[in-house]
C-alpha cells in the first residue's frame, strides 16, 4: 500500500482553489488526466477530465472546474472557481493509463469551504474571473469508465490525518460536456 | 519527523564555485519540490531556485539564472545547489524548503547555511 | 514577476493587543497567498497559506483573510513569542515565486 496524505485548504465560497498535480514527463505528458472527488463509504468520482490525448497549456472546463495540462513543466493545473460551501470534500489528481489503473498523483487535496467575506477592502479576483467569461467553444468528450476487479474499499475518514490507500482503489466514472476554455495570457 | 540539514557553505572569492547540500528525511523526498530560499544579512526573503518532484522540472530566480544548477538525488534524499560565477550579491543564507504537493509554498525549512562572498 | 509589498515595515504593539499586518500583491494571485513568521536566527516558520488557513500546529490567535491583491495576517492577543519578522509570499501561476519585504513586529 501506498502511503497517502492530505492537503488542507480552507477557502471562503467565491474564493478559488488553485493546485497543480506534479507527474512525471516521460511517462505522462499526453495521458489523460483526470480531477476526482472522494467522497466517505463511495468510489472516487470523476469530475473533470483532459482530452485524449492530452493537449498541451489547453484549458478545460467543465463547470467550475478548469484543467490546464502544462506538458512542458509536468503539472496539471487545478482551479476550482467561485467555490461554493458544498464543494469541500476530498479531492485527487489521477492519470489515466489503460489497460493499467489510473495512477494517482500525491498528494489529495482536503477542501474546506465556509461562508463569508473572503476578502479585505479592495481586494478583488478579476483578473482570472475575466479569463472565464470568454465566449467558449464547446466540445464533447469523455472521461472513460473503469471498473476495477478488486472491491473499493471505504473512502478515507475526514480528517487531515496520514491515510494508507492502495493505488488500486480507484475507480472512475464518465463526465461529458468537456468545455473548451481560451486563455490568454 | 520531517528535517533538512543544509551544507556547503562557507567562503568564497567572486568568480569562485560553491555546491550546497540539502540532506532530507521525514517524508518521501522524491514526491515532492523542493527550493533554495536565501536571506542576505539584515534583508529579507528571496526564492532562488525550485526542482519539482515527480517531473523534475527546475526555476531559477533571474538573479542567478546561468550562474546556479539544482539538482537533487533521490536515492540519497538529497537537494543540491551548484553555484559558479559568485557575486558578492550572492552573501547570504541559502535555506533549502520542502514544498507542499499542491503548490510552490514551503511548509518545512533547514536552518541555514551561511555563503560569504568576499575578496 | 509579481511584487509583494507589506506594511507598516514595522509594527509596534504592545503584548494582549492585536496586530494587524498587510500584504499587496501587484496583481492577482487569487488566494495563493502564505505568510512566514522568522525570529532571529531561525529559519522561516510557515503561519498561514492559501490566504486563511492555518498551518499545522499554528495557534488560533494568527488569522489570515483576503483574495485578488489585498491580504490580511492577524494576531489577536500579542504573546511574548509573537515578536519576530513576518513575510508574506505568492505562490500563483509559475516562478518567481515572490516574497514581501516583511514586517517587524516588536514590543511597543
Known amino acids: 500500500a501506498t502511503k497517502l496524505t492530505e492537503e488542507k485548504y480552507e477557502l471562503k465560497e467565491g474564493q478559488t482553489l488553485d493546485v497543480k498535480c506534479d507527474y512525471t514527463l516521460e511517462k505522462f505528458a499526453s495521458s489523460q488526466k483526470a480531477w476526482q472527488i472522494i467522497r466517505d463509504g463511495e468510489m472516487p468520482k470523476t469530475l473533470a477530465c483532459t482530452e485524449r490525448p492530452s493537449k498541451n497549456s489547453h484549458p478545460v472546463q467543465v463547470g467550475r472546474i478548469i484543467l490546464e495540462d502544462y506538458h512542458d513543466h509536468g503539472l496539471l493545473r487545478v482551479r476550482m472557481v467561485n467555490l461554493q460551501v458544498e464543494d469541500s470534500g476530498l479531492y485527487q489528481c489521477v492519470i489515466y493509463q489503460p489497460p493499467k489503473e489510473p495512477h494517482m498523483l500525491f498528494d489529495r487535496i482536503r477542501l474546506v469551504v465556509t461562508k463569508g467575506f473572503s476578502g479585505t477592502p479592495g481586494s478583488n479576483e478579476n483578473s482570472t474571473q475575466n479569463v472565464y467569461k470568454i465566449p467558449p467553444t464547446t466540445t464533447k468528450a469523455l472521461c472513460p469508465l473503469y471498473t476495477s476487479p478488486r472491491t473499493v474499499t471505504q473512502a478515507p475518514p475526514k480528517s487531515t490525518a496520514d491515510v494508507s490507500t492502495p493505488d488500486s482503489e480507484i475507480n472512475l466514472t464518465n463526465v461529458t460536456d468537456i468545455i473548451r476554455v481560451p486563455v490568454f495570457n | 519527523e520531517v528535517q533538512l540539514l543544509e551544507s556547503g557553505g562557507g567562503m568564497v572569492q567572486p568568480g569562485g564555485s560553491l555546491r550546497l547540500s540539502c540532506a532530507v528525511s521525514?517524508?518521501?523526498?522524491?514526491?515532492?519540490?523542493m527550493s533554495w530560499v536565501r536571506q542576505a544579512p539584515g534583508k529579507g526573503l528571496e526564492w532562488v531556485s525550485e526542482m519539482r518532484g515527480s517531473s523534475g522540472s527546475t526555476y531559477y530566480a533571474d538573479s542567478v539564472k546561468g550562474r546556479f544548477t539544482i539538482s537533487r538525488d533521490n536515492s540519497k534524499n538529497t537537494l543540491y545547489l551548484q553555484m559558479n560565477s559568485l557575486r558578492v550579491e550572492d552573501t547570504a543564507i541559502y535555506y533549502c524548503?520542502?514544498?507542499?504537493?499542491?503548490?510552490?509554498?514551503?511548509?518545512?525549512w533547514g536552518q541555514g547555511t551561511l555563503v560569504t562572498v568576499s575578496s | 514577476e509579481i511584487v509583494m509589498t507589506q506594511s507598516p515595515a514595522t509594527l509596534s504593539v504592545s503584548p494582549g493587543e492585536r496586530a494587524t499586518l498587510s500584504c499587496r500583491a501587484s496583481q492577482s494571485v487569487n488566494a495563493n497567498l502564505a505568510w512566514y513568521q522568522q525570529k532571529p536566527g531561525q529559519a522561516p516558520r510557515l503561519l498561514i497559506y492559501?490566504?486563511?488557513t492555518r498551518a499545522t500546529g499554528i495557534p488560533a490567535r494568527f488569522s489570515g483573510s483576503g483574495s485578488g491583491t489585498e491580504f490580511t495576517l492577524t494576531i489577536s492577543s500579542l504573546q511574548s513569542e509573537d515578536f519576530a519578522v513576518y513575510y508574506c509570499q505568492q505562490f500563483y501561476n509559475w516562478p518567481p515565486w515572490t516574497f514581501g519585504q516583511g514586517t517587524k513586529v516588536e514590543i511597543k
Open positions: 492559501g490566504a486563511s
Open positions: 521525514g517524508f518521501t523526498f522524491s514526491r515532492y519540490a
Open positions: 524548503a520542502k514544498e507542499f504537493s499542491s503548490n510552490s509554498l514551503f511548509d518545512y
